[in-house]
């Protein structure tokens, strides 16, 4: 089944993000994932859990999963690496970057997305852009095309609070509000874009969705600026 | 390390104020909410109230509004409380305590008393 | 505000014997997302109180095996599997579902 977790969002405007990337499992979408570099995609590391015996692919160009599209390719993966030091019971450092079996045809559709580096945190309140073909009802539904939802971050200490994710968010993580507008399953390894910037990754723990005081988490890319740079090298 | 330093002791005339401190060290000051908590001596703890360090908004027990006023010092990674007009009731061993996860980590307690 | 109960007041056991500490809460203490915060807490003799059990039965980190939570509702439980010296001390529950979070009158542990 897909992991992580829009909810309350729309519909994107066709191929506006043409960074964003499905993740796929034997042809269906599992998760999210952004075009960081030609031949690199930035997912998160619990996508690919289950994913022992599948055979991983990346949609690029994509809006709609199914419909054919001038500037829709499929790309076969030639390496995943995970964190180092994910693992499946804790959402600290869900990170995975996927190369593609060739760098990706640029154009229109398709084009990396500049990363934060610099290691700060966002200002609470900023309204950030998370984007996916995740679930958008509570009922399961899983839509064709891209959906998206501007989501305000959510200062750390209120996100740490016992009633909400009771000090599990790292310095490595942030959080969004999650008031009936929130990423939802399927939505793992997608991103969270702050001022055109890349700032965080869906994180794949599971959660509920569009519960106000279980804000979605995102892990901090500019916290593992030198891990996708080593990789990535 | 974890750790919620609070001030010394306090000997306070009946009708003044006092503020108490607690610094913290081995995490980042604005990452988590400060609660604070009074014990009298002999009985169970109170919550008095809690603040969020990146915005200095506070939250109340009712039993304690205008009497406890909670203020953040992000420079110093400092939480403060001031009570005032106090009394003999007021006496007390007064807690600072992080939230998250739960209340894992206290201060020392610093002890108020109000004698004249 | 939500009154939290507990039961005995004192608990004088011999070293090895199992205790067992009961807390009840006023009203629910089952929080709007689902989740119930009722802790458990030890404050030892002139120390500040130390966290065994959240969100009704997890223990946290470093905490023996011995100590255990259960319950649900308003009716609480923890228990101690065979009691040992540093277990002394005066055990208070913890609710935080609702404001303001309030403390149970706490359980003196003590030797028979």
């Known amino acids: 089944p897909p992991r992580g977790r829009i909810l309350g969002g729309r519909e994107a405007e066709a191929h506006a993000r043409p960074y964003m990337a499905s993740v796929q499992l034997n042809g269906a979408h599992l998760c999210g994932g952004v075009l960081v570099a030609e031949q690199w995609v930035l997912s998160a590391a619990h996508c690919l859990e289950d994913a022992a015996d599948g055979k991983v692919q990346v949609l690029l160009g994509a809006h709609s999963l199914s419909q054919p599209e001038p500037s829709k390719r499929l790309y076969d993966v030639l390496r995943a690496v995970p964190h180092p030091d994910s693992q499946p019971d804790t959402i600290d450092h869900d990170l995975l970057l996927l190369q593609l079996s060739e760098k990706a045809t640029l154009g229109p559709a398709v084009r990396p997305l500049p990363w934060q580096r610099v290691d700060r945190d966002v200002a609470p309140g900023t309204l950030c852009d998370v984007a996916g073909w995740g679930i958008v009802n509570h009922a399961g539904r899983r839509p064709d095309s891209l959906q998206h939802v501007l989501l305000p971050v959510l200062d750390r200490a209120t996100c740490n609070r016992r009633t909400h994710h009771d000090g599990a968010i790292t310095e490595r993580l942030m959080c969004a509000e999650s008031n009936r507008r929130d990423s939802c399953k399927g939505d793992s390894g997608g991103p969270l874009v702050c001022g055109g910037v890349l700032e965080g990754v869906v994180t794949s723990g599971s959660r509920v969705c569009g519960n106000r005081k279980k804000p979605g988490i995102y892990t901090r890319v500019a916290s593992y600026a030198a891990w996708i740079d080593s990789v990535l090298a | 390390e974890v750790q919620l330093q609070q001030s010394g002791p306090e000997l306070v005339k009946p009708g003044a104020s006092v503020k108490i401190s607690c610094k913290a060290f081995g995490y980042t000051f604005t990452d988590y909410y400060k609660n604070w908590m009074r014990q009298r001596h002999g009985e169970s703890l109170e919550w008095i109230g809690d603040i969020n360090p990146n915005s200095g908004d506070a939250n109340y027990n009712q039993k304690f509004k205008g009497k406890a006023t909670l203020t953040v010092d992000k420079s110093s990674s400092t939480a403060y409380m001031e009570l005032r007009s106090l009394t003999s009731e007021d006496s007390a061993v007064y807690y600072c305590?992080?939230?998250?996860?739960?209340?894992?980590?206290w201060g020392h307690g610093t002890l108020v008393t109000v004698s004249a | 505000d939500v009154l939290m109960t507990q039961t005995p007041l004192s608990l004088p056991v011999s070293l090895g014997d199992q205790a067992s500490i009961s807390c009840r809460s006023s009203q629910t203490i089952v929080h709007s997302n689902g989740d119930t915060y009722l802790e458990w807490y030890l404050q030892k003799p002139g120390q500040s109180p130390n966290l065994l059990i959240y969100k009704v039965s997890n223990r946290f980190s470093g905490v023996p095996d011995r100590f255990s939570g259960s319950g649900s509702g308003t009716d609480f439980t923890l228990k101690i599997s065979r009691v040992e010296a540093e277990d002394l001390g005066i055990y208070y529950c913890f609710q935080g579902s609702h404001v303001p979070p309030t403390f149970g009158g706490g359980t003196k542990l003590e030797i028979k």
């Open positions: 305590a992080r939230e998250g996860p739960s209340f894992a980590y």
